[in-house]
């Protein structure tokens, strides 16, 4: 019996037409959302003028329903057994589970100001970068609507670049209309052990952005993994919001609508530095921010966008260390609420739950040259905001579940 | 087309004033910022003054700093270099350059002051 | 200050000739550094910046190398146009400053 419902599971989590996991993962049957809190400052002229602790306020949820779309492109590949494709990206607001709306405002870190002032460290350019920031009435802090801080807005300081510059800043911008990719992974119809993993993104094994084994394309991107999944494992996935591929390890049972699931969660080791954890090295990229590579819990992902200062963390600077967290007021990080974790049906390796988490920081310096910077006496890694990305099998796709799969078995 | 053009040039005395102009053309100079330039005869270049964009502010050579002013007029899309107390040394060609991130990619045609008595 | 410091102060070659002139910085410019031309009796003519970037219009034969304190100008073949006198300039910290100048010669 358990040699047939073995033979079931391997066909039907190949990767190709026909298949239960074919046809949800061209499009998750899975209703995904996406929540964002924003860091309000509230103290924006201390810390300009005194180099004062940030106070921060979390405002939210503004949530977004995400990944309705379907992947595209899909191409199967006979000869090296793989499927390759683009995710597109698609947000919509939903009202209805937010506090507020899109045109709710917050005071943030100027992002085009602390990224020209990091991406031009040279002493004549700053001194440029001041006359247009003075210009345009920029600040260090600056004013916007959620629209504008996720999606985009014409920053009034880069417009006076007399060159063709992109004026536009977002955080996430561009999104809409965008796809993520391309991914190539493999089908599994020659090894059912390999179906899902990554073997090449945009067209490469590594990312370019990391030394060494940081630099890989590990396993596949969270959605499945291969069958069988064992509670010893360690299940590698890569996230392109992050940059980078990165890990889970079993934590707990959980059960997931009568589904018997194992819940894999980011454990801190992941996110820890060098010294306490030596693998880690190579996402260590500069030696003054991370004080010789002696702080964690941040990841620089300055390579990964264009040279922009941005670093990932977990929300509210869970699993990092004092350092970071010191100069920000108003922050409370609790496992329950900050960490990943991922509830995984382990005979077919499907995610059935999810939430991902994750914190967008920008760094801004001291600057000499740039008034709206020179009263700065230390480097901020300034939280923007943190956002909460869950998806939960439906009720009627869990009871086809429990009786086509786990009931069998059971 | 860009282009820039340098007046003001000529003989003067030890002690001297002279103002030089820039005229600028197929851009706006307030966007950009505008640098002088000179060359003494037959030695190298000498940056002297800038104006940052949107007039922000002027920066000087440690040579003509309290002597030279520069200055912008946008009405009338010109530049000029106010110098007084000139010496000797400061014969040279003048020429006003435009730039953006330091590097000058269009020069006027130069116009020679001569300080001598 | 930061001084630029270029060699050789001329030399001579012939057309067809790979020329090579380089630039010392005092101190690290990372790549903020550019390249002129200039003819007697005209005005400069940018044919390099950042180092490496060609200008619009310049000729391919002419590249440009380096970052932090050494630069190179290369020009592969050189042409009957291009003899005259070659300064490279820093462009990282005010007050700008340039190279004394390279005159090449026709041997």
């Known amino acids: 019996g358990d040699l047939l419902i073995q033979k079931t599971i391997k066909k039907q989590v190949v990767l190709e037409e026909g298949t239960i996991a074919f046809k949800n993962w061209v499009k998750t049957g899975t209703e995904v959302y996406r929540q964002f809190w924003i860091f309000d400052v509230q103290n924006p002229q201390e810390v300009m003028m005194n180099s004062s602790n940030i106070q921060v306020k979390q405002r939210g949820p503004y949530t977004y329903r995400v990944r309705f779309l379907a992947k595209e492109n899909v191409t199967q590949d006979a000869e090296d057994n793989t499927v390759s494709f683009l995710q597109p990206n698609g947000a919509i607001f939903e009202p209805s589970l937010s506090v507020g709306t899109e045109a709710d405002n917050f005071t943030v870190l100027n992002l085009a100001v602390a990224a020209a002032s990091h991406i031009y460290q040279n002493q004549f350019v700053q001194m440029i970068l001041n006359s247009l920031i003075n210009k345009s009435k920029s600040s260090m802090f600056q004013v916007r609507t959620l629209r504008e801080l996720l999606w985009g807005y014409r920053d009034p300081f880069l417009s006076l670049v007399p060159y063709p510059v992109t004026t536009t800043v977002g955080l996430f911008y561009p999104y809409n209309n965008t796809a993520d990719g391309v991914y190539k992974v493999f089908n599994g119809k020659d090894n059912i052990s390999k179906v899902a993993i990554i073997d090449t993104y945009k067209g490469k094994r590594n990312l370019s952005y990391w030394e060494s084994h940081c630099d890989m394309i590990n396993g596949t991107d969270a959605a499945s993994f291969p069958p069988f999944v064992e509670k010893s494992q360690v299940l590698q996935f890569f996230s392109s919001d992050i940059c980078r591929s990165i890990y889970a390890v079993f934590e707990s049972d959980v059960n997931l609508k009568g589904i018997p699931v194992y819940r894999f969660v980011l454990p801190s080791k992941a996110f820890a530095s060098p010294v306490e954890n030596p693998d880690n090295y190579c996402f260590c990229t500069e030696k003054i921010i991370s004080k010789n590579c002696t702080s964690y819990g941040v990841l620089d992902i300055s390579k990964c966008k264009e040279g922009r200062p941005v670093y990932i963390s977990l929300p509210h600077f869970l699993y990092a260390s004092p350092d970071v967290s010191e100069p920000i007021d108003g922050l409370n990080p609790n496992e329950e609420e900050h960490r990943t974790y991922l509830d995984i049906e382990p005979i077919t390796g499907f995610t059935l739950q999810f939430a991902k988490r994750l914190q967008v920081n920008l760094l801004v310096k001291p600057s000499e040259k740039i008034q709206v910077l020179k009263n700065l006496k230390r480097n901020y890694i300034v939280p923007i905001l943190w956002l909460n990305e869950t998806g939960t099998i439906g009720d009627e796709k869990a009871n086809m579940f429990r009786s086509q799969v786990t009931g069998k078995i059971n | 087309e860009v282009q820039l053009v340098e007046s003001g040039g000529g003989l003067v005395q030890p002690g001297g004033s002279l103002r030089l102009s820039c005229a600028a053309s197929?851009?706006?100079?307030?966007?950009?910022?505008i640098h002088w330039v000179r060359q003494a005869p037959g030695k190298g270049l000498e940056w002297v003054a800038w104006?940052?964009?949107?007039?922000?502010?002027?920066y000087y050579a440690d040579s003509v700093k309290g002597r030279f002013t520069i200055s912008a007029d946008t009405s009338k899309n010109t530049a000029y270099l106010q110098m007084n107390s000139l010496r000797a040394e400061d014969t040279a060609v003048y020429y006003c350059?435009?730039?953006?991130?330091?590097?000058?990619?269009?020069w006027g045609q130069g116009t020679l002051v001569t300080v001598s008595s | 200050d930061i001084q630029m410091t270029q060699s050789p102060s001329s030399l001579s070659a012939s057309v067809g000739d790979r020329v090579t002139i380089t630039c010392r910085a005092s101190?690290?410019?990372?790549?903020?550094v550019a390249w002129y031309q200039q003819k007697p009796g005209k005005a400069p003519k940018l044919l390099i910046s950042?180092?490496?970037s060609l200008y619009s219009g310049v000729p391919s034969r002419f590249s440009g190398s380096g970052s932090g304190t050494d630069f190179t100008l290369t020009i592969s073949s050189l042409q009957p146009e291009d003899f005259a006198t070659y300064y490279c300039?820093?462009?990282?910290?005010?007050?700008?400053?340039f190279g004394q100048g390279t005159k090449v010669e026709i041997k």
């Open positions: 104006i940052a964009p949107y007039g922000g502010e002027e």
């Open positions: 197929g851009f706006t100079i307030s966007s950009f910022g």
């Open positions: 101190q690290d410019v990372s790549n903020w």
């Open positions: 300039q820093q462009h990282s910290n005010a007050p700008l400053t």
């Open positions: 350059a435009r730039s953006f991130f330091g590097y000058f990619d269009y």
């Open positions: 950042y180092a490496t």
